[in-house]
């Protein structure tokens, strides 16, 4: 199931790159699959929020992204995720790349990457 989510994540990243005009030399943070969930590409200064993944949920391929972005980009969905919600994880896109997730998955979602790799 996670191989399928990873493959769909890579497809979504590719579509997002096209929409946002990202390429390999673009400044910012590339989209990534971190073995738990999918992170969209982001510009430096953006905070990207994701909901804790449902472990056995298949990504909906019709949905371009399932995250909310705070920053200059308005690319996101209508979920209006907020760090004041439970079960929301954020990463900041910095000049040095992606920050660590906050909160850590284990604290925000109750599981970590070791479980989702099995």
């Amino acid at each position: 199931i996670f191989k399928k989510e990873q493959a769909m994540c890579l497809e979504k990243i590719q579509r997002a790159n096209e929409l946002m005009g990202f390429n390999d030399s673009s400044p910012g943070c590339p989209g990534m699959w971190d073995n738990i969930t999918c992170w969209k590409p982001a510009h430096v200064g953006e905070m990207v929020l994701v909901s804790c993944p449902e472990l056995f949920r298949i990504f909906n391929p019709d949905q371009v992204w399932e995250t909310e972005t705070i920053g200059e980009s308005d690319f996101g969905d209508s979920n209006s995720l907020d760090l004041s919600d439970m079960g929301v994880v954020s990463r900041n896109c910095t000049e040095d790349g992606w920050s660590e997730p906050f909160p850590h998955y284990f604290d925000a979602c109750g599981f970590d990457e070791y479980e989702s790799e099995t």
């Epitope: 604290d107 109750g110 070791y114 099995t118």
Partner: antibody
């Protein structure tokens, strides 16, 4: 009914190792939904979470930075118990030590606790 | 580490009173907050998790509220067995940290 029973010495000399054990009944240390924690309480530091061990597809540990260089929490699956080892103790480590089970419902909380063990560090 | 503060540090009340204890976090913690009760010589006991959810077996006179940095524990119609010390605890970032406690004693 989950119960946690603590055992271990109440007096440890400075520079030595504090060792406590927490025996679990009504649950398993290998549970794939619980975490197994150690917390201590002293008048000077209040309640202080020290760390936890848990099993999912492998064993993992999380430790508080304040004790990370000195602490080890080990599960013992054959006896369904887990232990705390704190090395190089000083009188500041004198406290009541508790083991506790962590349960997840939107967040981690400690829903079952051991009876507590007063450990005094003194020569 | 996230610092947790509680007020008041102690309060005196009578059976039947309604009391409120406040807990404040040094940074936003959403609703990642638990409340515990501790009686002398005993281990802490979970009362409320995730700010307002009552733990199984806890009387409904206990209630919690709050989000972000400010939280409250309310006890309606204080009972003799409620005289104890109450602690809040954040569970958003390790190390999980506790407040210093609020001691509730008999007026």
């Amino acid at each position: 009914q989950v119960q946690l029973q603590q055992s271990g010495p109440g007096l440890v000399k400075p520079s030595q190792t504090l060792s406590l054990t927490c025996a679990i009944s009504g649950d398993s240390v290998s549970s794939n939904s619980a975490t197994w924690n150690w917390i201590r309480q002293s008048p000077s530091r209040g309640l202080e979470w020290l760390g936890r061990t848990y099993y999912r597809s492998k064993w993992s540990n999380h430790y508080a930075v304040s004790v990370k260089s000195r602490i080890t929490i080990n599960p013992d699956t054959s006896k369904s118990q887990f232990s705390l080892q704190l090395n190089s103790v000083t009188p500041e480590d004198t406290a009541v030590y508790y083991c506790a089970r962590g349960t997840w419902k939107q967040l981690w909380f400690l829903d079952h606790w051991g009876q507590g063990t007063l450990v005094t560090v003194s020569s | 580490d996230i610092q947790m503060t509680q007020s008041p540090s102690s309060l005196s009340a009578s059976v039947g009173d309604r009391i409120t204890i406040t807990c404040r976090a040094s940074q936003q913690i959403a609703r990642y907050l638990n409340w515990y009760q501790q009686k002398p010589g005993k281990a802490p006991k979970l009362l409320i998790y995730a700010s307002y959810n009552l733990q199984s077996g806890i009387p409904s006179r206990f209630s919690g509220s709050g989000s972000g940095t400010d939280f409250t524990l309310t006890i309606n119609s204080l009972q003799p067995e409620d005289f104890a010390t109450y602690f809040c605890q954040q569970a958003i970032i390790q190390p999980y940290t506790f407040g210093p406690g609020t001691k509730v004693d008999i007026k």
